[in-house]
């Protein structure tokens, strides 16, 4: 008595896969494995499957049913943020080869990184051109103002509406200022938040607002507060620059803008006798505070010019280094104030139409706007690589 | 409360042009794709167009294509269906609807009736 | 164009007991992740109203009562126990592609 196996029905392939290797017949212990095309993968019901092989069972059935051959789907591609995603292929498609466009929020944003285009690959991701997996990055549109020039604090004149939206007022023990950077940092000066650099949550942080007493301004509060580590407290005020990271990203609008940081470019507007512009709620001509945010435009003194003005007592010699720049008329009458410490000296860059920061308030003359003496400012161009790696490390 | 609101329908010699607005309010406007969909009357639901986000892309029912455009006005918060050379069988109730991946918000409908 | 056939065209159901709509489309709607199959209830003189998106996925604030199923080109939908507010019309649709089409539409009566 002799019995032969069963031969098992031909394999089928599913729509968009092939049987490997293909046989005239299959009998007992025959095998074949299913290969979907490039970008579909195996589906047992709904699991997915990372091969598949059935074998020919001597009842002449197969062990195991046939899978399927789906489409590859990358899902709902992420939120960007300050940003929006767009289907180009079709509402909703996040199949295979569909394409999708990020873009970054207009006026305020530009998208770094790549063109915002990405295609749901056969891997199951959605890939940028360049080939990355990860989203784009809307960064925020730094040093638009609503002041085209400087016309013509202490001497100044009231502020309005976007003329200085990255203006920020610092209040925990003193009045101080800073100068938004991106989207959650602020740059001041280290005198200013010294005695906060333990105990950064006690900084009250306020933007998008004129009035120094307004119940109507963003909040923001403080995570870390970075100091230079060159700054000596009480002994001088080189490098006096320090950096406020913000616990949350503030929403950019035409009130809160952040400055930009000088390019390598920058000194050529930054010149002897070029015109800067301070702004805060510093002291005024009344000895005041501001009520109103106020401004100053102000001109860069010569350095040895400056150097020489604080040789002299009560001053050590020494006082201004190369870390300093000096702004105000010789004449006297227009300088920053005690309250303004820690705000931002801009200047326009004629080439891209956008402000930068080139100094940080940080000291002077006992008497402000006093004739013969400057109001001094942190060189923040000299502070670059220290700005950028605090930024990229944390 | 996410709400959208048609206006803009009424009664339209054939050949004619209308255009409907869909008020968009309580979601952010900008970072939704949109529809227009209609229903004749006592029949089903027939999707008519569809505009991504941010203006991107559009994408129409071949019993519409060249005849109506959707566009969107996102600081505005408004969607809208300019249809020109009306027929008689584009008759119907005309729902603004949200959603990329379904629909998932419906406006309360405006109504076209396309007759001399 | 994907095809969308509902069945049955009405159905009466006595409260309590169960109500069975099914959908067949012309070619798959499913991908690896999704299914791309969808139910609304209208009610007269008003919008559709999202139930289930994505084949099975409940939209918040809809009863529990109603459930979805199904892949590739069959899917149910199911309400259990049918309640009197449920008298409306079903519709299925897909956004497997443009033009997104919905089904002919079932009318649910409650005896």
């Known amino acids: 008595y002799t019995s032969t196996a069963q031969p098992c029905p031909y394999p089928m392939a599913p729509p968009n896969g092939h049987v490997s290797p293909v046989q005239a017949k299959y009998i007992l212990k025959d095998s074949f494995s299913i290969f979907c095309e490039t970008g579909y993968e195996l589906l047992q019901g709904h699991l997915p499957l990372k091969s598949f092989t059935a074998v020919c069972q001597k009842d002449g059935s197969w062990d195991r049913p046939m899978p399927a051959c789906s489409i590859v789907d990358c899902g709902p591609p992420d939120d960007l943020p300050s940003g929006r995603v767009e289907y180009i292929t079709g509402p909703g498609v996040t199949t295979y080869k569909a394409v999708i466009q990020y873009s970054c929020e207009e006026t305020f944003y530009t998208m770094k990184v790549n063109d915002g285009k990405y295609v749901c690959e056969a891997d199951g991701f959605w890939t940028s051109s360049k080939g990355e997996k990860s989203l784009p990055v809307c960064e925020p549109v730094c040093g638009l103002s609503a002041r085209t020039t400087g016309g013509r604090i202490y001497g100044g004149q009231k502020a309005k509406p976007g003329d200085f939206p990255w203006q920020v007022l610092i209040l925990g023990g003193t009045t101080a200022a800073g100068a938004l950077l991106y989207d959650n940092w602020v740059l001041t000066a280290a005198h200013a938040v010294y005695e906060q650099k333990h105990d950064a949550s006690a900084l009250d942080i306020r933007m998008g607002t004129l009035k120094r007493l307004s119940p109507h301004y963003t909040q923001a509060w403080s995570e870390a507060v970075f100091i230079h580590e060159g700054y000596t407290h009480d002994a001088g005020f080189d490098n006096d620059i320090a950096l406020i990271k913000l616990n949350n990203k503030v929403v950019i609008n035409s009130n809160i803008t952040p400055i930009c940081l000088p390019r390598k470019e920058a000194e050529s507007f930054m010149r002897t006798d070029d015109i800067g512009t301070a702004s805060g709620w510093g002291l005024t001509q009344r000895g005041f505070l501001a009520r109103n945010l106020m401004y100053v435009d102000i001109p860069i003194v010569d350095h040895q010019k400056c150097t020489a003005a604080y040789e002299k007592p009560p001053y050590p010699r020494g006082s201004v280094t190369a870390n300093m720049l000096c702004a105000g008329l010789e004449s006297g009458g227009k300088d920053s104030c005690r309250g303004d410490s820690g705000g931002a000296l801009v200047f326009l860059d004629s080439e891209t139409e956008r402000w930068f920061v080139g100094g940080i308030v940080s000291w002077g003359s006992m008497n402000c706007g006093e004739a013969g003496q400057y109001g001094v400012y942190t060189k923040v161009i000299n502070y670059i690589p220290w700005i950028e790696n605090i930024i990229s490390d944390f | 409360d996410v709400q959208l609101v048609e206006s803009g329908g009424g009664l339209v010699q054939p050949g004619g042009s209308r255009k409907l607005s869909c008020a968009a309010s309580?979601?952010?406007?900008?970072?939704?794709?949109m529809h227009w969909v209609r229903q004749a009357p006592e029949k089903g639901l027939e999707w008519v167009a569809y505009?991504?986000?941010?203006?991107?892309?559009?994408f129409y029912a071949d019993t519409v294509k060249g005849r109506f455009t959707i566009s969107r006005d996102n600081p505005k918060n408004t969607l809208f269906l300019q249809m020109t050379s009306l027929r008689s069988e584009d008759t119907a109730m005309y729902y603004c609807?949200?959603?990329?991946?379904?629909?998932?918000?419906w406006g309360a409908g405006t109504t076209v009736t396309v007759s001399s | 164009d994907i095809v969308l056939t509902q069945s049955p065209a009405s159905l009466a159901v006595s409260l309590g007991q169960r109500a069975t709509i099914s959908c067949r489309a012309s070619?798959?709607?499913?991908?690896?992740?999704?299914?791309?199959m969808h139910w609304f209830q209208q009610k007269p003189g008003q919008p559709p109203n999202l139930l289930i998106k994505?084949?099975?996925n409940l939209e918040s604030g809809v009863p529990a009562r109603f459930s979805g199923s199904g892949s590739g080109t069959d899917f149910t939908l199911n309400i259990h126990p049918v309640e009197e507010d449920d008298t409306a019309t079903y519709y299925c649709?897909?956004?497997?592609?443009?033009?997104?089409?919905f089904g002919g539409g079932t009318k649910l009566e409650i005896k």
């Open positions: 609807a949200r959603g990329d991946r379904n629909f998932d918000v």
């Open positions: 309580g979601f952010t406007f900008s970072s939704f794709g």
């Open positions: 505009i991504s986000s941010g203006s991107s892309s559009f």
């Open positions: 070619q798959s709607v499913t991908s690896s992740r999704y299914s791309y």
């Open positions: 994505h084949a099975s």
């Open positions: 649709q897909h956004s497997w592609e443009v033009p997104w089409t």
